[in-house]
């Protein structure tokens, strides 16, 4: 039975040409994180796999950056970069859970952080 | 040419270890991941594991975790794999393939011949 | 893990006619899929990679298609040495990079 919840950043925001951080943090279960996928909408960025470690897609490897921790750092922000991001832990036994980030991309200097939420 | 060339056939008995070679050639080594899958008489394909070639970091399949070591000499080019305690049931054709880069992943370009392992009493 | 699928598992089909092989993913891989063909008493050989682009020295009667779960290969038009076992496969989540039970092309 998959006991975990996926805690995320929430909504974000951030300006154009600047960069943010995309965290997401599993808790209450025991299960073994095997990988995490980073994807934005059905595209992969990044991975970081428990036994090899961080893995840059080469499409974004010059504007992504691995952590903190199992987060993943977006630079050189662009409108472009608003939509949906999804963090996607692999565990074991449990199997997978998912969280889901928003990121909008300003134009103004005016960027507010969402408040944290938690994804059951 | 690209090319993996393994060891030869091998019989064993239960319970005991056989170590599998496969040498590569026609590419830089270490920059390519390296995986072992194999394929039990006239069943699928099955994968054990994977090595990173540059720095020696594995990441094995849950059912062979305990049994299975996979090794690296970058002198000669060439990666290991070793299963132990081994049983009827692991008569198979053991082959490497080079996967991706190191860097990314990818799927399994280039194979070696296979190396056939009998595990009989 | 995710579990890959393939149907059917046996395809009966003439030469010259087209042959189209499916696989289904668990959950999404993407488009990180590939194909592979075997034949008997030989290693399997790369066809497909990114669900859609042809290995080196692949022809191009050979084409895949598909993004997430659901994902096709289909060989326009039959030739004799293409009648083997083919094999779909995800590499995005490991351990284990898992295989599909395979498809055997057989002559009708």
């Known amino acids: 039975m998959m006991t975990g919840t996926i805690e995320t950043t929430g909504n974000i925001s951030a300006e154009k040409g600047g960069s943010i951080i995309l965290q997401c943090h599993l808790s209450s279960t025991t299960a073994q994180v095997t990988q995490v996928n980073w994807e934005q909408q059905d595209q992969l960025l990044a991975i970081c796999n428990a036994d090899l470690g961080w893995h840059i897609s080469p499409s974004f490897k010059d504007r992504v950056a691995p952590g903190p921790g199992l987060g993943l750092t977006l630079q050189s922000l662009t409108v472009n970069d608003t939509g949906e991001y999804f963090c996607i832990y692999h565990t074991y036994p449990d199997g997978t859970y998912t969280g889901r980030i928003f990121l909008e991309v300003l134009e103004s200097s005016v960027a507010e952080h969402g408040a944290r939420f938690q994804i059951p | 040419q690209v090319q993996l060339v393994q060891s030869g056939a091998e019989v064993k008995k239960p319970g005991a270890s056989v170590k599998v070679s496969c040498k590569a050639s026609g590419y830089t080594f270490r920059e390519y991941y390296m995986h072992w899958v194999r394929q039990a008489p006239g069943q699928g394909l099955e994968w054990m594991g994977i090595i990173n070639p540059s720095i020696g970091l594995t990441s094995y399949a849950r059912k062979f975790q305990g049994r299975v070591t996979m090794t690296r000499d970058t002198s000669t080019s060439t990666v290991y794999m070793e299963l132990s305690s081994l049983r009827s049931e692991d008569t198979a054709v053991y082959y490497c393939a080079r996967g991706g880069r190191t860097t990314w992943i990818g799927a399994l370009d280039i194979w070696g011949q296979g190396t056939m392992v009998t595990v009989s009493s | 893990e995710i579990v890959m699928t393939q149907s059917p598992a046996t395809l009966s089909v003439s030469p010259g006619e087209r042959a189209t092989l499916s696989c289904r993913a668990s959950?999404?891989?993407?488009?990180?899929l590939a194909w592979y063909q075997q034949k008997p008493g030989q290693a399997p050989r790369l066809l497909i990679y990114g669900a859609s682009t042809r290995a080196t020295g692949i022809p191009a009667r050979f084409s895949g298609s598909g993004s997430g779960t659901e994902f096709t290969l289909t060989i326009s038009s039959l030739q004799s040495e293409d009648f083997a076992v083919y094999y779909c496969q995800q590499y995005v989540v490991w351990p284990p990079l898992t295989f599909g039970g395979g498809t055997k092309v057989e002559i009708k």
């Open positions: 959950q999404s891989v993407s488009s990180n």
